[in-house]
């Protein structure tokens, strides 16, 4: 059964969705193959912790240790990219940390922005000077271990020169790389030394080889190229927001909750509100009101903006956030001040109600 | 691992009512969604509703509004489907899938006839 | 209610061959589809969701594309085990409604 009572019937449900959200990802801890990794629980209190990977109990194994609020990864491996969470069970109420794990030596193979100025990679000779193929700028290569997730665009360069000007071909596990080998080709860029395939898949797994030579001799450099796949998840909400907020009576306050969601988010702002002067009905759930919700005809729903407050404003307001997948929420609360006090920033503190994860 | 058991099926009279489990196991019941999803025989897929069991949210396809009610039971990691004033058109499989619809129980075949 | 059109409703091919399957959005739903199979007697299985991220285990012939209201599912190269119905989904709105179905058969 439900936990609450709506105060009016609201629709909850968005006609439309919304065309754009803003997202925010959890904290993320990155580890390079093969590598351990010791991460601590960000919860207070606990007096049990569990753990999860993408949703699914985590249990102690040859590689995984679970001590108190630390969990430790050895030997980590890009199957151990995901996201994890902890919760501490406390004798009152539970609450959740999400953080992301990326096991990965790099997402791509030097910078983007380098590609708009390349002209450092493009090295001239002097037609006199006769000279085999040689790197220009080993740091963009060293990294040869490549773990990407599934649909990101990488990018492996092997920037050189040589006189005359070497060409560059590319091979897949030692074998010509074709543009029929992949689903959406890939494209080669040469004034930047550069192949770049697009929306990787786990089929583009493999060694990659850069083979860049002219009539004087030969050089290549291989990558490895791992992708990782990806799990649908629930919404996460940036820890710490919405923030406790005080305002003095007429004043405007905004809380703020920053969404990270794959699908489609809904976004609720509720507040517990009184109703002939209860705020529990006759079932004993806590009345609530659905003060904006994500829309058509909602602006940005990440924020809920207060004007010229008065002092029934005072209270818990709780952002729920839900997709196809589950939900999420968080709560703040405001303080209203008479005229004479100013205003302040109070400390963060954790409010949950207890029906709310 | 992840899975769903679903109760076993059922034939029902026009007009009566049916309830159909869904036990969960192998990931944490109250952080997913469950969906309820029907196929009538030889028919597609058709969304009934679903609930978020820790706080028992429920959302419906208003085709099935009044009829659906969609419950959960945290202490046995168990969702309910029930269906009432039955018709002959609601002869179909059901099946619970869990929020992300990567895993699904097996159905459950309601019968309906008089 | 957001209406999910699939073609063709049925589809024959041989082994090997690219099998193509769209779907139409009345409405826009983003990225926010997913792809099922599902064979006879047996639950619908995921493949993609997303629009275009294959879920695990999946294997690499299948793929998704598309965004807004038009997407396209394929089978770069056939294979015996592929013989099944084939859904579209969008998960943005409620209610979450699925294409009518593919059936793929093998030549």
């Known amino acids: 059964r439900p936990s609450f009572s709506l105060v009016e019937d609201t629709t909850l449900e968005p006609e439309e969705p919304p065309t754009k959200y803003q997202i925010s990802q959890p904290e993320v801890y990155v580890a390079a193959p093969g590598e351990s990794l010791e991460v601590r629980c960000l919860l207070k209190d606990a007096a049990v912790i569990s753990w999860t990977k993408d949703g699914v109990h985590l249990g102690p194994n040859n590689r995984t240790v679970l001590i108190g609020e630390y969990l430790q990864i050895k030997g980590a491996t890009p199957r151990d990219s995901g996201l994890y969470a902890c919760t501490a069970s406390r004798t009152v109420d539970s609450e959740t940390w999400y953080f992301m794990v990326n096991v990965t030596d790099a997402i791509s193979s030097g910078d983007d922005e380098d590609d708009t100025d390349g002209a450092e990679d493009f090295v001239s000779e002097n037609s006199n000077n006769k000279r085999a193929p040689y790197w220009t700028n080993t740091e963009k290569m060293e990294k040869r271990l490549h773990a990407v997730p599934a649909a990101n665009t990488v990018k492996f360069r092997c920037p050189a020169g040589g006189n005359p000007m070497p060409t560059m071909r590319w091979l897949k596990n030692g074998k010509e790389f074709k543009q029929e080998h992949r689903i959406g080709g890939y494209k080669v860029r040469n004034q930047h030394w550069s192949l770049i395939m697009e929306s990787v898949v786990p089929s583009d797994k493999g060694n990659y080889t850069c083979v860049v030579e002219n009539e004087y001799g030969s050089i290549n450099h291989t990558y490895h190229l791992d992708v990782v796949e990806r799990s649908p998840h629930r919404p996460i909400l940036q820890a710490g927001l919405p923030a406790n907020a005080s305002t003095v009576v007429g004043g405007d306050v905004e809380f703020v909750c920053k969404v990270y969601s794959d699908a489609q988010p809904h976004i609720q702002w509720i507040k517990h509100v009184e109703k002939n002067g209860s705020k529990y009905g006759p079932d004993g759930l806590p009345y609530l009101k659905v003060l904006k919700h994500s829309g058509i005809n909602s602006s940005n729903a990440e924020v809920l903006a207060l004007f010229n407050v008065t002092e029934a404003d005072a209270g818990e307001y709780i952002c729920k956030v839900s997709n196809y997948i589950g939900q999420a929420n968080q709560s703040a609360w405001l303080t209203v001040l008479p005229k004479q006090q100013a205003p302040g920033r109070e400390k963060e503190i954790t409010a949950s109600p207890d029906y709310l994860e | 691992q992840v899975q769903l058991v679903q109760s076993g099926a059922e034939v029902k009279k026009p007009g009566s009512s049916v309830k159909v489990s869904c036990k969960a196991s192998g990931y944490i019941f109250t952080s997913y969604n469950v969906h309820w999803v029907r196929q009538a025989p030889g028919q597609g897929l058709e969304w009934i509703g679903s609930i978020y069991p820790d706080n028992g949210d429920s959302s419906y396809n208003q085709n099935y509004k009044g009829r659906a009610t969609i419950t959960a039971d945290k202490s046995t990691s168990t969702a309910y489907m029930e269906l009432s004033s039955l018709r002959s058109e609601d002869t179909a499989v059901y099946y619970c899938?869990?929020?992300?619809?990567?895993?699904w129980g097996q159905g459950t075949l309601v019968t309906v006839s008089s | 209610d957001i209406q999910m059109t699939q073609s063709p409703s049925s589809l024959s091919a041989s082994v090997g061959d690219r099998v193509t399957i769209t779907c139409k959005a009345s409405n826009g739903v983003s990225n926010d589809i997913a792809w099922y199979q599902q064979k006879p007697g047996k639950a619908p299985k995921l493949l993609i969701y997303?629009?275009?991220y294959r879920y695990s285990g999946v294997p690499s012939r299948f793929s998704g594309s598309g965004s807004g209201t038009d997407f396209t599912f394929t089978i770069s190269s056939l294979q015996p085990e592929d013989i099944a119905t084939y859904y579209c989904q969008q998960h943005s709105t409620t209610p979450y409604t699925f294409g009518q179905g593919t059936k793929l058969e093998i030549k």
């Open positions: 997303s629009a275009s």
């Open positions: 899938a869990r929020g992300d619809f990567a895993y």
